[in-house]
Amino acid sequence: GSVPPMVNVTRSEASEGNITVTCRASSFYPRNITLTWRQDGVSLSHDTQQWGDVLPDGNGTYQTWVATRICQGEEQRFTCYMEHSGNHSTHPVPSGNSHHHHHHHH
């Protein structure tokens, strides 16, 4: 059967006026997954995103990540979109004082 991913969005200061947002998916099976950043619901172009490899996490499941740099103050426009085994979810960027949002999807 399939195991849905845990999805976790974090933010970190990049350069002046910019932040890096990272979306991590972990503990999922099978390994096929779509993970992408969207702006206003539209996927960002590939050249503005960085992806990690889909790697085994040691429990028979997998993990991966995608990151992009955005302008501070524009966070509300951006979401991380995940598709796995016919299910999907959307994950917002956490506010500045909250660095971790975990969601398990079934």
């Epitope: 702006q39 206003d40 619901g41 539209v42 996927s43 960002l44 172009s45 503005t48 509300q76 426009r77 979401t79 979109y81 598709e83 999907h88 979810s89 959307t90 994950h91 917002p92």
Partner: antibody, heavy 118, light 108 residues
């Protein structure tokens, strides 16, 4: 086949409110944003706002923020646009549209004509 | 707000001729955020070209798009009768999302 089917034409008095619906089918409703756009007679297109039905986030064009409410009912795959304090210049065709993978508006509803007249 | 200015407002051409439509932005936008739509009388707009130069599904190859920065162009290499319509450019780079005022391509 992706379809966005909107409610029928409305005639309203100045000061009244109107609520237009947009029923989506042919795709997973919560996987794409629903945008609202209007077009006054003989005029161009004007973006009103959008909703992300999965998380319920709404972004408005500031020009409309005080008079517009966008909502979505995921159980019926339907989005709604409510416009209050109507005035004659709100007479327009109101369109819903779906966000695409690579563009803001990839599928459109058939439009709903709202006429504001005393 | 990014203002998109389309020119000309009206283009009068005959079938078979080449149409060149311009869209000028009030400030620079990434080519990833510039799209074109076609609208025929009494119909909803239809996505024509996304991200400056990519044809939407079902759009004939006579349509093409180009540009960068503040200047973008939609070209129809040889007009067919069904191409006579209004064309809008749209930017998705910054809020509010905005459209150009449209260029009407009419039969001469």
């Amino acid at each position: 086949e992706v379809q966005l089917v909107q409610s029928g034409a409305e005639v309203k008095k100045p000061g009244a409110s109107v609520k237009v619906s947009c029923k989506a089918s042919g795709y997973a409703f919560t996987s794409n944003n629903i945008y609202w756009v209007r077009q006054a007679p003989g005029q161009g297109l004007e973006w009103i706002g959008y909703i992300d039905p999965y998380i319920g986030r709404i972004i408005y064009n500031q020009q409309f923020k005080d008079r517009v409410t966008i909502t979505a009912d995921t159980s019926t795959s339907t989005a709604y646009l409510e416009l209050s304090s109507l005035r004659s210049e709100d007479t327009a065709v109101y369109y819903c549209s779906r966000s695409g993978e690579r563009s803001n508006f990839d599928y459109w509803g058939q439009g709903t004509l709202v006429t504001v007249s005393s | 707000e990014i203002v998109l200015t389309q020119s000309p407002a009206t283009l009068s051409l005959s079938p078979g001729e080449r149409a060149t439509l311009s869209c000028s932005a009030s400030s620079s936008i990434s080519s990833n955020y510039l799209h074109w739509y076609q609208q025929k009388p009494g119909q909803s707009p239809r996505l024509l070209i996304y991200r400056t130069s990519n044809l939407a599904s079902g759009v004939p190859a006579r349509f093409s798009g180009s540009g960068s920065g503040t200047d973008y162009t939609l070209t129809i290499s040889s007009l067919e009768p069904e191409d006579f319509a209004v064309y809008y450019c749209q930017q998705g780079g910054s809020l509010p999302l905005t459209f150009g005022q449209g260029t009407k391509v009419e039969i001469k």
